[in-house]
């Protein structure tokens, strides 16, 4: 039994980090392997997840990790049964992928625009409740070419979109992702998509 | 949010026995220790022992053979029992949780105890 | 065991002083000595772990420092809400054990 490509590992800084790793060969996850995790603290509790298969030969691991703060770093280790494959630690800090924004709607608003509202992922009290900007796409649900990207940089998850600069009767669709500057970190998902017609007459 | 809250008797006769109950919320008590320590009147804390995230249990050797501690994972409670009490264990009982290595980082109020007959 | 020291048992202090408070474990530590406030209604709060990592919600006239077995408090800028027992910790080895105390007083 042998890892083809090592462990990485995603934080989404407030409850959960997702880990993901290729086996040599086709591999049942969760009969065969553990991914053993440790605050590397003396006296912090060892934490055992039972990783499931994404692919054949992918397997990925969820654990609940708690309070997270810029310091901690965690000691992975990931067992066959007896056999440790692989060994090494993880910085939520320095590899945070934040959770997705949530509760996209588009509402006509005044003076001929759209307003595009969605749902910060994370309470006040988390760090990055205040750290993160926001990408929209919006793209004509017929026109594959006619698509557009809007990065949000202030806060409030809000975008105004003049009705004028999309296509008078074709029907939209909107998707918002998010990220956090300081922490650097990678993109989000993207959220789920919402639809909407363009009734706009010039 | 995390909370600890300990109830006990108040009150235990020399020579009898002391049950406390640290009942928790916000957290999940097989992901996390629970300490108890105690602090006598007008004196400093004392750790007396702890019972890991998986169920073992660590003690302060000089209450080894009169401390027994326990949980319920699914009432998120924990128990300590302590025997063969004397008016020197008069103190005040606190639970706490940790989470980063040894550092206690939430603590219940605290119950009083007094041991006297 | 390792015994933990604290030689101050009472310390008086205006508001807006900055306050040192000095822990001594019998061994080296290797940094996991963490702070602890302790209010006159008993109330206990965890301020600094392993030395001088602020615990999250602590306001940050709060700092820890120190080595091997010489720690440690200060408070920045006294303030009202301060007045309580500060008590350290060592967090190397079981068993956990105190350091007996400091009482901060309003002069």
């Known amino acids: 039994v042998k890892v083809l490509h090592e462990p990485s590992c995603f934080s989404d800084y407030i409850s959960t980090s997702v880990c993901q790793w290729k086996m040599d060969h086709p591999t049942n996850c969760s009969a065969e392997l553990r991914l053993s995790y440790q605050l590397d603290f003396m006296g912090s509790e060892n934490h055992t997840c039972v990783p499931e298969n994404r692919e054949d030969s992918v397997c990925v691991c969820s654990m609940p990790i708690d309070d997270a703060v810029e310091a901690d770093v965690y000691q992975l280790d990931l067992w066959a049964g007896q056999q440790l494959l692989w060994s090494g630690s993880f910085q939520p800090s320095k590899h945070v992928k934040p959770r997705t924004p949530g509760n996209l709607t588009v509402h006509p608003n005044i003076s001929h625009t759209w307003l595009l509202m969605w749902t910060n992922p994370y309470p006040t009290e988390n760090h990055l409740h205040s750290e993160l900007t926001y990408m929209v796409n919006v793209s004509n649900d017929n026109d594959p070419e006619d698509f557009k990207v809007y990065n949000v940089t202030y806060m409030g998850p809000t975008l105004r979109l003049a009705a004028s600069t999309l296509k008078s009767g074709a029907s939209y669709s909107a998707r918002v992702r998010a990220w956090a500057q300081t922490y650097n970190s990678t993109w989000s998902d993207w959220s789920p998509s919402t639809t909407w017609l363009n009734y706009y007459e010039p | 949010q995390v909370q600890l809250k300990e109830s006990g008797p108040g009150l235990v006769a020399p020579s009898q026995s002391l049950s406390i109950t640290c009942t928790v919320s916000?957290?999940?008590?097989?992901?996390?220790?629970v300490h108890w320590v105690r602090q006598p009147p007008g004196k400093g804390l004392e750790w007396l022992g702890m019972?890991?995230?998986?169920?073992?249990?660590d003690y302060n050797s000089v209450f080894k053979s009169r401390l027994s501690i326990s949980k319920d994972n699914s009432k998120s409670q924990v128990f300590l029992k302590m025997n063969s009490l004397q008016t020197d264990d008069t103190a005040m009982y606190y639970c706490?949780?940790?989470?980063?290595?040894?550092?206690?980082?939430?603590w219940g109020q605290g119950t009083s105890v007094t041991v006297s007959s | 065991d390792i015994q933990m020291t604290q030689t101050t048992s009472s310390l008086s202090a205006s508001l807006g002083d900055r306050v040192t408070i000095s822990c001594r474990a019998s061994?080296?530590?290797?940094?996991?000595l963490n702070w602890y406030q302790q209010k006159p209604d008993g109330t206990v709060k965890l301020l600094i772990y392993?030395?001088?990592r602020l615990q999250s919600g602590v306001p940050s006239r709060f700092s820890g420092s120190g080595s091997g077995t010489d720690y440690c408090l200060t408070i920045s800028n006294l303030e009202q809400e301060d007045i309580a027992t500060y008590f350290c910790?060592?967090?190397?080895?079981?068993?956990?054990?105190f350091g007996s105390g400091t009482k901060l007083e309003l002069k």
């Open positions: 706490a949780r940790t989470y980063r290595g040894y550092a206690l980082d939430y």
């Open positions: 916000g957290f999940s008590l097989s992901r996390y220790s």
């Open positions: 019972i890991w995230g998986g169920g073992s249990t």
């Open positions: 061994q080296d530590i290797s940094n996991y």
């Open positions: 392993y030395t001088s």
């Open positions: 910790q060592q967090a190397n080895t079981l068993p956990l054990t």
